[in-house]
C-alpha cells in the first residue's frame, strides 16, 4: 500500500491507478479529471479589499469607493457587529477585539462614521463630524506574541518558544521550504517551493518544534499561488497552504501577524530571519535545528546597483541582509519569515531568492508582504 | 473642489446686529466642523467659535459669549455668525473657515472674508 | 486660555536666505499646531498641520518642527511669493488661540 501511494494514484469509476507523475500535469488521466484537481490552484489579485489596517495604532481604514478616497473609521457608534464585519471583509473568521484610541495631531485622513451594508463596511451618508475624537483600533486575531524574546546576535540556535508560527513544510518527508502560520487554516510561504511538485496530496506541513522531523504532519487541503506574470518572473513569490484540519494554538503553535498596509521599513532597520537551510553556500546540509539570525533592510537602490541585482529588486521585494554580508537565508529557507518587531511580530518578508548565500553586495531577496495583503484577504474571503 | 462663499459686505450702526452666512460647497456638509475667525484692521487673527453643522451644537470663545450665535441650514449647506450690540471695535474682517472631521482637527479651507464696519 | 507667541514681530531677508519663525505656547499642546501664510487683502492659507507635517500643494521649502511648547516654522530658500505675515495656531484646546503674527518683508 505504502509503495503503490508514492509511485501511484487511484482514479475512481472505473477504479485503476496511473502513475504519480501524471498528476497535476494538465492533462485529464483519470475519466472524471481527479488527476488535476488536488493541484496548486492559482488565483488572481482580485479587487481591491474596501477596509485595511494602518500602522497607527491598527486603526481601521475604510474605502469609499465612490471616489477612491480612504477614510479613517470614527468610534462613534462602532459595534462587535461592524468589527466583525470589517475582518470578515479581509477573511478572518475568528472573534475581533476592539477599542477607541485619541485622534493624533497628525491625522491626515477624515475620519467617518460606519456603518454596514450588504455585509460591507460603509461611510455613513452625512454622518456628522467625529464627536467621541477616537478612531476604532481593530485587531482580528491575537498574533505575533511569542514566548521568548530572541537576543540580538549575529547567528544561532532558535528555540520554538521564539518562533511559534514557524513551520516547516514537506514533500514526501522532506524538508523543502519554511513556511509561517497566519491563523488556525492557513500558513504563508514561498510560491517556488511547488514549481517541482504541484499535486497537493505529498504536501505536508510540521508545526510546533524547532527540530526537524520531530513533530506530527499536518495535511494539506489546498495550496494557492498568484497567476505567474511574465514580465516580472521574480515577483509574486507568494503562496498560501490551507490546511485540513484547523491548528489548536498553544505556546510553540501560535500565529505571526501580517504587516500594515503602510508599514514602511526605512533601510537598517533591524529585522530577523529564521529556517533549517543550508549552513554552507552549495554545500552542507540542511540544518537539524532552527536557526536564527538578526539582519537588517537593505535600500532598494543599493540592492539595485550594478554590483548586486542589477534592476531585478522589483517594487514588490525587498532587500535584507547585513552590509558587510554572512548572514543571510539560504536553500531550504525559502518560504521562511523576515519579521519585524513592533508591538507585535510581523511577517514583512517571505525568503523568495538571491544569487549565492551571504555575499556582501548580494543579499537576501524577500517578497514584500504588504504588497499582496489585498491578495492575501481575496484568497481568504474566496475560502471562508 | 471645496468652495466657501460669503456674503457681502455690511455697515452697521453700534448697537445693531450683523448676520454673516457662509455657504460651502464641494463636500459633505455635515462631516467637517465650521470656524469662525475675525481679523481686525492692520491686527491678528482672532477666533470667536465654532459649530458642528450636523448637530448644530456650537463652542464660543468667553469674550463673544452672549453677543455671538452660530446657526446651520443643512438644506442649503450654509452656516450663519450673528454678532449683536456691536461697537466700533468689532469693525473687521469675518472668516468662515473649514475645521477637518474632528474635533481637534486645524482649519484647512477659509472663506473669502467679509468685511463688517461699524460706524455711527 | 492658551497664550501662543511670534518672534520676531517682522523682520526684512533676501530671496534665496533660511528664515526661521518660532512659535511658544504658553502650556504644552502636544502637537496641535498649525502655520498659516496670509497675504494682503487674502483669506489665511494652511502650509504646516500637527507642527510638521506639510498640507498638500504646500511647496517643501517650508517645514516645521517642535513639540510640546516650542515650535519653528522654517523657509528653506524663500522665494518672491513667500513674502507675507504668518501665524501659528494651536487646536490643543477650546478657545483656539492665534499667534500675534510675523511679517516677513523684503529686505
Known amino acids: 500500500k505504502v509503495i503503490l501511494d508514492k509511485y501511484y494514484f487511484l482514479c475512481g469509476q472505473p477504479l485503476h491507478f496511473i502513475p504519480r507523475k501524471q498528476l497535476c500535469d494538465g492533462e485529464l488521466d483519470c475519466p472524471l479529471g481527479e488527476d488535476e484537481e488536488h493541484c496548486v490552484k492559482s488565483f488572481p489579485e482580485g479587487p481591491a479589499v474596501a477596509v485595511r489596517l494602518s500602522k497607527d495604532r491598527s486603526t481601521l481604514q475604510v474605502l469609499d469607493s465612490a471616489t477612491g478616497n480612504w477614510f479613517s473609521a470614527c468610534f462613534d457608534n462602532f459595534t462587535e457587529a461592524l468589527a466583525e464585519t470589517a475582518c470578515r471583509q479581509m477573511g478572518y473568521s475568528s472573534k475581533p477585539t476592539f477599542r477607541a484610541v485619541e485622534i493624533g495631531p497628525d491625522q491626515d485622513l477624515d475620519v467617518v462614521e460606519i456603518t454596514e451594508n450588504s455585509q460591507e463596511l460603509r461611510m455613513r451618508n452625512s454622518s456628522g463630524p467625529c464627536l467621541s475624537g477616537s478612531l476604532v483600533s481593530l485587531h482580528c486575531l491575537a498574533c505575533g506574541k511569542s514566548l521568548k524574546t530572541p537576543r540580538v546576535v549575529g547567528v544561532e540556535e532558535a528555540s520554538v518558544d521564539s518562533w511559534p508560527w514557524q513551520v516547516s513544510i514537506q514533500y514526501d518527508k522532506q524538508h523543502v521550504c519554511g513556511g509561517s502560520i497566519l491563523d488556525p487554516h492557513w500558513v504563508l510561504t514561498a510560491a517556488h517551493c511547488f514549481r517541482k511538485h504541484t499535486d497537493v496530496f505529498n504536501w505536508k506541513v510540521r508545526a510546533g518544534s524547532d527540530k526537524l522531523g520531530s513533530f506530527p504532519s499536518l495535511a494539506v487541503a489546498k495550496i494557492i499561488i498568484i497567476e505567474f506574470n511574465p514580465m516580472y518572473p521574480k515577483d509574486n513569490d507568494i503562496a498560501l497552504m490551507k490546511l485540513q484540519f484547523p491548528l489548536t494554538f498553544s505556546g510553540t503553535v501560535r500565529p505571526i501577524c501580517l504587516p500594515f498596509f503602510d508599514e514602511e521599513l526605512t533601510p537598517a532597520t533591524p529585522l530577523w530571519i529564521i529556517g533549517w537551510g543550508f549552513t554552507k553556500q552549495n554545500g552542507g546540509k540542511m540544518s537539524d535545528i532552527l536557526l536564527q539570525a538578526s539582519v537588517q533592510v537593505i535600500d532598494s537602490t543599493r540592492c539595485n546597483a550594478d554590483d548586486a541585482y542589477q534592476g531585478e529588486v522589483t517594487e514588490k521585494m525587498m532587500c535584507a541582509g547585513i552590509p558587510e554580508g554572512g548572514v543571510d537565508t539560504c536553500q531550504g529557507d525559502s518560504g521562511g519569515p523576515l519579521m519585524y518587531q513592533s508591538d507585535q511580530w510581523h511577517v514583512v518578508g517571505i525568503v523568495s531568492w538571491g544569487y549565492g548565500c551571504g555575499g556582501p553586495s548580494t543579499p537576501g531577496v524577500y517578497t514584500k508582504v504588504s504588497a499582496y495583503l489585498n491578495w492575501i484577504y481575496n484568497v481568504w474571503k474566496a475560502e471562508l | 473642489q471645496v468652495q466657501l462663499v460669503q456674503s457681502g459686505a455690511e455697515v452697521k450702526k453700534p448697537g445693531a446686529s450683523v448676520k454673516v452666512s457662509c455657504k460651502a460647497s464641494g463636500y459633505t456638509f455635515t462631516t467637517y466642523y465650521m470656524h469662525w475667525v475675525r481679523q481686525a484692521p492692520g491686527q491678528g487673527l482672532e477666533w470667536m467659535g465654532i459649530?458642528?453643522?450636523?448637530?448644530?451644537?456650537?463652542s464660543y470663545a468667553q469674550k463673544f459669549q452672549g453677543r455671538v450665535t452660530m446657526t446651520r441650514d443643512t438644506s442649503t449647506s450654509t452656516v450663519y455668525m450673528e454678532l449683536s450690540s456691536l461697537r466700533s471695535e468689532d469693525t473687521a474682517v469675518y472668516y468662515c473657515?473649514?475645521?477637518?472631521?474632528?474635533?481637534?482637527?486645524?482649519?484647512?479651507?477659509w472663506g473669502q472674508g467679509t468685511l463688517v464696519t461699524v460706524s455711527s | 486660555d492658551i497664550q501662543m507667541t511670534q518672534s520676531p514681530s517682522s523682520l526684512s531677508a533676501s530671496v534665496g536666505d533660511r528664515v526661521t519663525i518660532t512659535c511658544r505656547a504658553s502650556q504644552s499642546i502636544s502637537s496641535w499646531l498649525a502655520w498659516y501664510q496670509q497675504k494682503p487683502g487674502k483669506a489665511p492659507k494652511l502650509l504646516i498641520y500637527a507642527a510638521s507635517s506639510l498640507q498638500s500643494g504646500v511647496p517643501s521649502r517650508f517645514s516645521g518642527s517642535g513639540s510640546g511648547t516650542d515650535f519653528t516654522l522654517t523657509i528653506s530658500s524663500l522665494q518672491p511669493e513667500d513674502f507675507a505675515t504668518y501665524y501659528c495656531?494651536?487646536?490643543?484646546?477650546?478657545?483656539?488661540?492665534f499667534g500675534q503674527g510675523t511679517r516677513l518683508e523684503i529686505k
Open positions: 495656531q494651536q487646536s490643543y484646546s477650546t478657545p483656539r488661540t
Open positions: 459649530i458642528n453643522p450636523s448637530g448644530g451644537s456650537t
Open positions: 473657515a473649514r475645521g477637518r472631521s474632528w474635533y481637534r482637527s486645524n482649519v484647512d479651507y
